[in-house]
């Protein structure tokens, strides 16, 4: 990469020295690397405390990863004239504990945003959505990644975590036409009731390695255009009726469940049922039994009824301490 | 109790191809993968692939495809490994194993030698 | 595929010592992991599964631990019969991975 403080069609990406002039339109930041041609900029492991000001008004790939961003204030990428043509923004792994509100205002073309490995605090409600209007223009966003932006447990606020994160998914109405979302590694224990509702041109959802323990107060009734659902790495024991009929319901997608702890007892009768009936999971002979130990291993599908059983509960007078 | 009885140890020629066997008993077989390990001298364990017998179903290390064909027969609770185009890297120890999410009862070990 | 490594390849220890064996995954593999000793007359047995549920007749003096990368096998009290080698193995993702092995002699 050669160093220059002008764009130059020779070089295909070009490292920017600091100038004394003002910046030109196309001029490469400094501690970037700029390459008109694939209308791509790259800021990647700088240290970088703040988004550069003078982002040449070609980007449409911005890649800031590897940085020291900590907060990204409103209007972080607003400039006159605005970044029309910033597609994808790759914020991941820049030490982010803080996302406010309106951070991504002004970017009419916005389609992908990468937010992984960041520990967010604090993410504002309406960091995607803009406005803390009821219903707010919608947004451009089409693929939102969050993986891993759960922060340490001593940088939690009171709140819950997931209950934030929906929040911030749901405000304005904004995201009705995100196509992919990804959530995976971030300890949810439960997703908030509401989140998918306000999703429904979902085709992707990525909620693998987390802590879910159950599905029974989700519902995914609405995501005709759903495609992959990615359950897998989390702490699923059973799936219900309730779930096994929406998922059954949705025409096009296909489930992954690894790596769940299932207890196969008498309440796993249903889902024994309707796995060995349906095309929905994939790689369902790989699903075993966690739980009890004696079924520890056993392919779900190969189960009957015989062997899903629950201890029978004593009566209160015959119960011991 | 659970058991996996391998068959015994086999001498054979580069090129050969051979089919080593694990009986399973004390536990109902087709509701288990069946896995088996590789174990060169000197080295240790490798994954080479699994199968569920009730089904059928297989899946291999990407290492070992066209070199491991695992069968099953449930009539006899039998697992087969048939080994091709056998090489002096072949020789080594090979175990089967019950699986899952962990391999909980493993076999004794059947020896391959290939020698010319 | 999932590398796994087991740094030390061979440990001395006097019996009744407290020993401790490592390993690592060379990415984070969410607790799916499992450790098996292998005697010397090649016999092979499950002892740990998912980091640190003690498999049934497994004695208790053996215990697990980790997260992320990083999980350990502890043997509290170790008696003649532990001699063997040790081997993780991750189930994460296909295809199964083991560590290289520690073998554990007497001082």
């Known amino acids: 990469t050669s160093s220059a403080s002008s764009s130059s069609s020779s070089a295909p990406f070009l490292a920017s020295a600091a100038s004394a002039q003002p910046p030109l339109p196309d001029q490469c930041p400094a501690l970037c690397e700029c390459s008109e041609a694939a209308r791509t900029v790259k800021c990647v492991n700088r240290n970088l405390t703040e988004v550069p000001t003078d982002l040449p008004l070609y980007v449409r790939n911005l890649f800031l990863t590897g940085n020291q961003l900590a907060v990204l204030p409103a209007g972080a990428f607003a400039r006159r004239p605005p970044l029309a043509e910033l597609a994808a923004l790759n914020l991941s792994g820049s030490r982010l504990d803080e996302v406010r509100g309106g951070a991504f205002e002004h970017l009419p073309s916005l389609r992908q945003l990468d937010l992984s490995h960041n520990p967010l605090a604090y993410l504002s409600p309406f960091a995607f959505s803009g406005s803390n209007a009821s219903i707010s223009a919608p947004s451009p966003l089409v693929e939102l990644i969050l993986n891993h932006i759960v922060p340490p447990d001593d940088k939690r606020q009171n709140r819950s975590f997931e209950g934030m994160v929906a929040a911030a998914l749901v405000a304005g109405r904004a995201l009705q036409g995100l196509h992919l979302l990804e959530l995976a590694s971030n300890h949810f224990l439960y997703l908030p009731r509401d989140v998918l509702a306000q999703l429904p041109s979902l085709r992707y959802l990525d909620l693998s390695n987390n802590s879910l323990v159950s599905l029974t107060y989700v519902s995914f009734r609405n995501l005709t255009h759903l495609e992959s659902l990615h359950l897998e790495d989390n702490a699923l024991k059973v799936l219900h009726n309730g779930t096994l009929a929406e998922l059954q319901g949705l025409p096009h997608v296909r489930v992954f469940l690894d790596n769940n702890p299932w207890v196969c007892d008498c309440h796993m009768a249903d889902m024994v049922t309707w796995l060995k009936q349906t095309g929905v999971v994939q790689g369902k002979d790989r699903l075993t039994c966690a739980f009890p130990e004696k079924m520890r291993n056993r392919v779900l599908l190969e189960l009957n009824s015989a062997d899903l059983d629950c201890d029978p509960i004593l009566p209160p007078s015959l119960q011991t301490s | 109790q659970v058991q996996l009885r391998q068959s015994g140890a086999e001498l054979m020629k580069p090129g050969a191809s051979v089919k080593l066997s694990c009986k399973a008993t004390?536990?109902?077989?087709?509701?288990?993968?069946i896995e088996w390990v590789k174990q060169r001298p000197g080295h240790g364990l490798e994954w080479i692939g699994e199968?569920?017998?009730?089904?059928?179903?297989?899946n291999y290390n990407e290492k070992f495809k066209g070199k491991a064909t695992l069968t099953a027969d449930t009539s006899s609770n039998t697992v087969y490994m048939q080994l091709s185009s056998l090489t002096i890297e072949d020789s080594a120890i090979y175990y089967c194993?019950?699986?899952?999410?962990?391999?909980?009862?493993w076999g004794q070990g059947t020896t391959l030698t290939v020698s010319s | 595929d999932i590398q796994m490594t087991q740094i030390t390849s061979s440990l001395s220890a006097s019996l009744g010592d407290r020993v401790t064996i490592g390993c690592s995954a060379s990415q984070g593999i969410n607790n799916n992991l499992n450790w098996y000793q292998q005697k010397p007359d090649g016999t092979v047995k499950l002892l740990v599964y998912?980091?640190?549920s003690l498999h049934s007749g497994v004695p208790s003096r053996f215990s697990g631990s980790g997260s992320g990368t990083d999980y350990s096998l502890t043997i509290s009290n170790l008696e003649p019969e532990d001699i063997a080698t040790y081997y993780c193995q991750q189930f994460i993702k296909l295809p199964y991975t083991f560590g290289g092995g520690t073998k554990l002699e007497i001082k």
């Open positions: 194993a019950r699986g899952g999410r962990d391999f909980d009862y």
């Open positions: 004390g536990y109902t077989f087709t509701g288990y993968w």
């Open positions: 199968i569920l017998p009730g089904r059928g179903s297989s």
């Open positions: 998912y980091t640190s």
